[in-house]
C-alpha cells in the first residue's frame, strides 16, 4: 500500500550490521507524488565503487545512487547526511554486506516522504500540448480559446471534425485557411452523397501548403482521402502533389487532416462535386446499344438489341432486346443477359417426306426436306431447303415458314402393262 | 375384262376394288376415290381395297382396306327406284371421301386427272388401258387383275351395237357427249364388275404418266364397244367437291 512517509534502517541498526546480508525495501507513495529520500546516518564499510558493502537507490531501471563509507551533515541545522529527490512514486533501496568487516560498522538510517512534483516543469517531455497546470498530487492541461482538450486530457486541438457534407457540390478548407492551421489536430470531414453519385475532388496546386515530409518521406502533417477500401494520400508539402482531379468511385468520402505540434502552414482548400456514377461500356457481343454514348452514368437506361439471328434467352422465353440500367454501384442491371444465336429447334416432320438431322439448329443452319420418292413429290415448290432465320423459324426462300407439301405422284405405274399374246 | 391379259397391281396401282357391289374405282389422291355413280348408288358405305393383284379373301386380308367417310354422287346422276332398268347413264360419276389418307407405294398410287386444255380432248383411235376384276370370257368374276388396251371409237359405233338383254327399247338408251365410246378391236372390252375403273390414257404432255380419261360405265354388249364416263367434263365438279370436303391437313 502506498504511504506518505516511512523509515528505513539497516539490519540491527544502531548495532553493527551482520556480514553477508542482502535486503531490499520497496518504497511506494501515491500517484502524482515524487519521493524525497534522506539519510540521517551512514556508516558502511568503504570500498572502491562501494564494491564490498553498499546501499543502492534504484528508480525503475536507473540507479539513482550507491552509498558507502561514513557521512556527516554539512548543515549544523540539519541532520541529513545524503538525500535523493525522484519525480516518481516508486523507489527501491537495496542494502548488501560482504562476508567480512574489518571494523564494526553501524549501517544507515533513512527516511522518505511523499513530495509534490511539478509535472509541468520536472520532466523533459512536456505533458500538455498547450497549458500545463500543476497541483499537489497531480496536474491538468488546458487550452487556449477555440481549442478543446482531446480525450487523452493532454492534447489540445481545434474543433474541426464532425462536419458532414451532403450537397452535390461544395468547398472544404483546413481550419483558419489561409491562415496557419492549428497544430496537434485531427480534422475529419465526411462527404455523403446520394447513392449513384461518386465524389470527385478538385484541388489547385497553389491551394495546398502543408508541412513537408521528413527525411524518410513520412508526412508530419497530412491530408488523406478515404473512399471505402480505397485511400488517396497521405499528401503533404508545398503545392498539392496528388492528382488535381480525384474520382473516388464512391458516394462516401472521408477527409482526414492530421497535424503535429510544429510547423504550421497555411493549409489547403478543395472543391468537390457529385458526378453520376459511371458504368463501363461493356462488351456485349452480337448486339447494339441504344442510345450509343461515349460515357454512361447512373440512371442511364440503354436498350440492348440483339443482331438478327441472336436472341436473349431468359428462363425459357426468347426476346430480341432488353433494357439495362446503370445502377448506383456502377454496374449494369441485367448484366447476366446475353445475345446468343437463335435456336430454331428440331424441324417439324412432314407427311410423306423427311428432313435430315441438321448438324446444328442454330441461326443460319440449313435443312433440306425431301419427299418419299418416287411416290411423292414436293407440290408447293421452294426446293425443300430451309434455313434457321432470325425469328426462330425455319424459312424457305419461296414458301417462307410454310412447310413443303409432299403429294402423291399420279399416273405412273411401277411397271408398264404388257399385253400377253394369246 | 374381255379379251384382256393378266395384269399386276403394279401396272395399275390406282386400281381400287369394291367388294359390294363387285366393281372398280380409281384412286386420285390420298383421300379420294373416283368411281361410277351406279357403283355406289346402292351402297353408300362401300368397302374398298388397294394394293393387291388378287382379290382372293386371304389376299385381301393382307391388302389395304379403305374406309369411306362420305360418298358424293354427281348431282346430274338420276337416281331410279329400279336401277336395273336404267337406260340413262349420263353423269355416271361419283367420289368417295376416305376417312384416312392412303399411303402410297409401288402397289398403291393415284392416277392423274385430265387437264382442262384441248390437249386432253380424245381423238378416235387414241389408246387407253382398262383394268378390273369383272367378268371375263371364262368366268363371272376374275380373281386376279385383268387389263386390256383399247382405242377410242366414235360414239355411233357404240350406238350401232345391239343391246344384249335389253331392258327397254334400243332407242331408250341415252348417249351424250359426257360419254366416250371405246373398244371394238380384237373383242377387247370391259364388262360387268369392271364398272368405276379408269380408262387410262397416256398424258399428252408427259408420256410417263397416265390420266383417267374415262370411267367404266356401261355397254350394249361385252366384247364389243363400251361406254366410259368422260372425266374431262367433270374436272371442275371433282375439284370443287374435293376442295369443299377436305381437311386443313390436305389443303
Amino acid at each position: 500500500e502506498p504511504t506518505m512517509y516511512g523509515e528505513i534502517l539497516s539490519p540491527n541498526y544502531p548495532q553493527a550490521y551482520p556480514s553477508e546480508v542482502e535486503k531490499s525495501w520497496d518504497i511506494e507513495v501515491p500517484e502524482g507524488y515524487g519521493i524525497h529520500l534522506y539519510f540521517t546516518h551512514l556508516d558502511i564499510e568503504l570500498s572502491e565503487n562501494c564494491a564490498y558493502d553498499s546501499v543502492q537507490i534504484i528508480s525503475g531501471d536507473t540507479e539513482e545512487g550507491r552509498l558507502c563509507g561514513q557521512r556527516s551533515s554539512n548543515n549544523p541545522h540539519s541532520p541529513i547526511v545524503e538525500e535523493f529527490q525522484v519525480p516518481y512514486n516508486k523507489l527501491q533501496v537495496i542494502f548488501k554486506s560482504d562476508f567480512s568487516n574489518e571494523e564494526r560498522f553501524t549501517g544507515f538510517a533513512a527516511y522518505y516522504v511523499a513530495t509534490d512534483i511539478n509535472e509541468c516543469t520536472d520532466f523533459v517531455d512536456v505533458p500538455c500540448s498547450h497549458f500545463c497546470n500543476n497541483f499537489i498530487g497531480g496536474y491538468f492541461c488546458s487550452c487556449p480559446p477555440e481549442y478543446f482538450l482531446h480525450d487523452d486530457m493532454k492534447n489540445c486541438g481545434v474543433n474541426c471534425s464532425g462536419d458532414v457534407f451532403t450537397a452535390l457540390i461544395g468547398e472544404i478548407a483546413s481550419p483558419n485557411y489561409p491562415k496557419p492551421y492549428p497544430e496537434n489536430s485531427r480534422c475529419e470531414y465526411q462527404i455523403r452523397l446520394e447513392k449513384g453519385f461518386q465524389v470527385v475532388v478538385t484541388l489547385r496546386r497553389e491551394d495546398f501548403d502543408v508541412e513537408a515530409a521528413d527525411s524518410a518521406g513520412n508526412c508530419l502533417d497530412s491530408l488523406v482521402f478515404v473512399a471505402g477500401d480505397r485511400q488517396f494520400g497521405p499528401y503533404c508539402g508545398h503545392g498539392f502533389p496528388g492528382p488535381l482531379n480525384i474520382e473516388t468511385k464512391s458516394n462516401a468520402l472521408d477527409i482526414i487532416f492530421q497535424t503535429d505540434l510544429t510547423g504550421q502552414k497555411k493549409g489547403w482548400k478543395l472543391r468537390y462535386h457529385g458526378d453520376p456514377m459511371p458504368c463501363p461500356k461493356e462488351d456485349t457481343p452480337n448486339s447494339v446499344w441504344e442510345p450509343a454514348k461515349a460515357k454512361y452514368v447512373f440512371r442511364d437506361v440503354v436498350q440492348i438489341t440483339c443482331l438478327d439471328g441472336f436472341e436473349v434467352v431468359e428462363g425459357r422465353v426468347g426476346a430480341t432486346s432488353f433494357y439495362s440500367t446503370c445502377q448506383s454501384n456502377g454496374k449494369w442491371s441485367n448484366s447476366k443477359l446475353k445475345c446468343q444465336p437463335v435456336d430454331c429447334g428440331i424441324p417439324e416432320s412432314i407427311e410423306n417426306g423427311k428432313v435430315e438431322d441438321p448438324e446444328s439448329t442454330l441461326f443460319g443452319s440449313v435443312i433440306r426436306y425431301t419427299c418419299e420418292e418416287p411416290y411423292y413429290y414436293m407440290e408447293n415448290g421452294g426446293g425443300g431447303e430451309y434455313h434457321c432465320a432470325g425469328n426462330g423459324s425455319w424459312v424457305n426462300e419461296v414458301l417462307g415458314p410454310e412447310l413443303p407439301k409432299c403429294v402423291p405422284v399420279c399416273g405412273v405405274p411401277r411397271e408398264p402393262f404388257e399385253e400377253k399374246q394369246r | 375384262i374381255i379379251g384382256g391379259s393378266d395384269a399386276d397391281i403394279k401396272n395399275f396401282p390406282w386400281q381400287v376394288f369394291f367388294d359390294n357391289p363387285w366393281a372398280g374405282g380409281a384412286l386420285i389422291n390420298e383421300y379420294w376415290v373416283l368411281t361410277a355413280a351406279h357403283v355406289v348408288e346402292g351402297n353408300r358405305e362401300p368397302t374398298m381395297y388397294v394394293g393387291s393383284t388378287s382379290v382372293q379373301t386371304s389376299r385381301l386380308a393382307k391388302s389395304k382396306m379403305l374406309t369411306p367417310e362420305h360418298v358424293f354422287i354427281h348431282p346430274g346422276w338420276k337416281l331410279l327406284e329400279v336401277p336395273e332398268g336404267r337406260t340413262n347413264f349420263d353423269n355416271d360419276i361419283a367420289l368417295v371421301r376416305l376417312k384416312d389418307p392412303v399411303k402410297m407405294g409401288p402397289t398403291v398410287s393415284p392416277i392423274c386427272l385430265p387437264g382442262t386444255s384441248s390437249d386432253y380432248n380424245l381423238m378416235d383411235g387414241d389408246l387407253g388401258l382398262i383394268s378390273g376384276w369383272g367378268r371375263t370370257e371364262k368366268r363371272d368374276r376374275a380373281v386376279r387383275l385383268k387389263a386390256a388396251r383399247l382405242p377410242v371409237a366414235p360414239l355411233r359405233k357404240c350406238k350401232e351395237v345391239k343391246v344384249e338383254k335389253p331392258t327397254a327399247d334400243a332407242e331408250a338408251y341415252v348417249f351424250t357427249p359426257n360419254m366416250i365410246c371405246a373398244g371394238g378391236e380384237k373383242g377387247m372390252d370391259s364388262c360387268k364388275g369392271d364398272s368405276g375403273g379408269a380408262f387410262a390414257v397416256q398424258d399428252p404432255n408427259d408420256k410417263t404418266k397416265f390420266y383417267a380419261a374415262g370411267l367404266v360405265s356401261w355397254g350394249p354388249q361385252c366384247g364389243t364397244y363400251g361406254l366410259y364416263t368422260r372425266v374431262k367434263n367433270y374436272v371442275d365438279w371433282i375439284m370443287k367437291t374435293m376442295q369443299e370436303n377436305s381437311t386443313p391437313r390436305e389443303d
Epitope: G318, E348, T361 | -
Partner: antibody
Framework: EVMLVESGGGLVKPGGSLRLSCAAS????????MSWVRQAPGKGLEWVAT????????YYLDSVKGRFTISRDNSKDTLYLQMNSLRAEDTALYYC???????????WGQGTLVTVSS | QIVLTQSPATLSLSPGERATLSCTAS???????LHWYQQKPGKAPKLWIY???NLASGVPSRFSGSGSGTDYTLTISSLQPEDFATYYC??????????FGQGTKLEIK
C-alpha cells in the same frame, strides 16, 4: 396402321435404373421426331424428352436432365428412354408419341408403367 | 416455361348441351403449335385438334377449336355420350419445354 408399343417398365428402387423401349411400325420411323410423355397416377400429362428424326438433337425436361437419356435406333424402328438415378416422383405411366406437323403428337403408344419405390 | 392453365378443372354438362373448354397460356403461343388431346380413363391420349382449329382424323365435326395469342378454346356444339372424357391442351415452343395444361374433365351431369 401406325403402331407404337412401349415396354421395359416395372418396379425399381430409388436410385435405380430402367430402360424403356418403344417399337414403331406402320410408318417410316426415321422420318419423324419422337417424344416421351409421362402421366403420374391420377395426374395430368408431362412432357419428358424429344429426339430429332436422325437422333442428333435431344431436349429434356429440366427435372430429368442428366438422369434420363432419349435415343433411337432407326434401323430397328425403336425409341428408347434410359432412366438413371430414379426418384419416387418419376413414378408414372410413360408414353411414347410421334411428333407430327406443328409438333402435335399424332400417335401414342398404350404406355408402360414405371414405379419407383423402396 | 410457358404455363398452360385450363378452365374449368371439371365441367358437368348433359348430352346435347354446348361445352366450352378454355386454355390460357402464360405468354403468347403460336396458333400453329397449340393442340388438344382427348383422354379416356385407362387409355392413351388421342390427338383431337391440332394447330388450334384442325380436327384430327375421325374427330366429329361438332368439335371446333379457336384462339390466338394466349387464349384458346375447344368447343363441342352438342355433347354426345362418347365426348365425356378429359381434354388436355398442349403447346410447343422452340426453347422448350413442351407443356400441357392440367386438363379439363368433362363429366355427365
Amino acid at each position: 396402321e401406325v403402331m407404337l408399343v412401349e415396354s421395359g417398365g416395372g418396379l425399381v428402387k430409388p436410385g435405380g435404373s430402367l430402360r424403356l423401349s418403344c417399337a414403331a411400325s406402320g410408318f417410316t420411323f426415321s422420318n419423324y421426331a419422337m417424344s416421351w410423355v409421362r402421366q403420374a397416377p391420377g395426374k395430368g400429362l408431362e412432357w419428358v424428352a424429344t429426339i430429332s428424326s436422325g437422333g442428333s438433337h435431344t431436349y429434356y425436361l429440366d427435372s430429368v436432365k442428366g438422369r434420363f437419356t432419349i435415343s433411337r435406333d432407326n434401323s430397328k424402328d425403336t425409341l428408347y428412354l434410359q432412366m438413371n438415378s430414379l426418384r419416387a416422383e418419376d413414378t408414372a405411366l410413360y408414353y411414347c408419341a410421334r411428333l407430327f406437323t406443328g409438333y402435335a403428337m399424332d400417335y401414342w403408344g398404350q404406355g408402360t408403367l414405371v414405379t419407383v419405390s423402396s | 416455361q410457358i404455363v398452360l392453365t385450363q378452365s374449368p378443372a371439371t365441367l358437368s354438362l348433359s348430352p346435347g348441351e354446348r361445352a366450352t373448354l378454355s386454355c390460357t397460356a402464360s405468354s403468347s403461343v403460336s396458333s400453329s403449335y397449340l393442340h388438344w388431346y382427348q383422354q379416356k380413363p385407362g387409355k392413351a391420349p388421342k390427338l383431337w385438334i391440332y394447330s388450334t382449329s384442325n380436327l384430327a382424323s375421325g374427330v366429329p365435326s361438332r368439335f371446333s377449336g379457336s384462339g390466338s395469342g394466349t387464349d384458346y378454346t375447344l368447343t363441342i356444339s352438342s355433347l354426345q355420350p362418347e365426348d365425356f372424357a378429359t381434354y388436355y391442351c398442349h403447346q410447343y415452343y422452340r426453347l422448350h419445354p413442351i407443356t400441357f395444361g392440367q386438363g379439363t374433365k368433362l363429366e355427365i351431369k
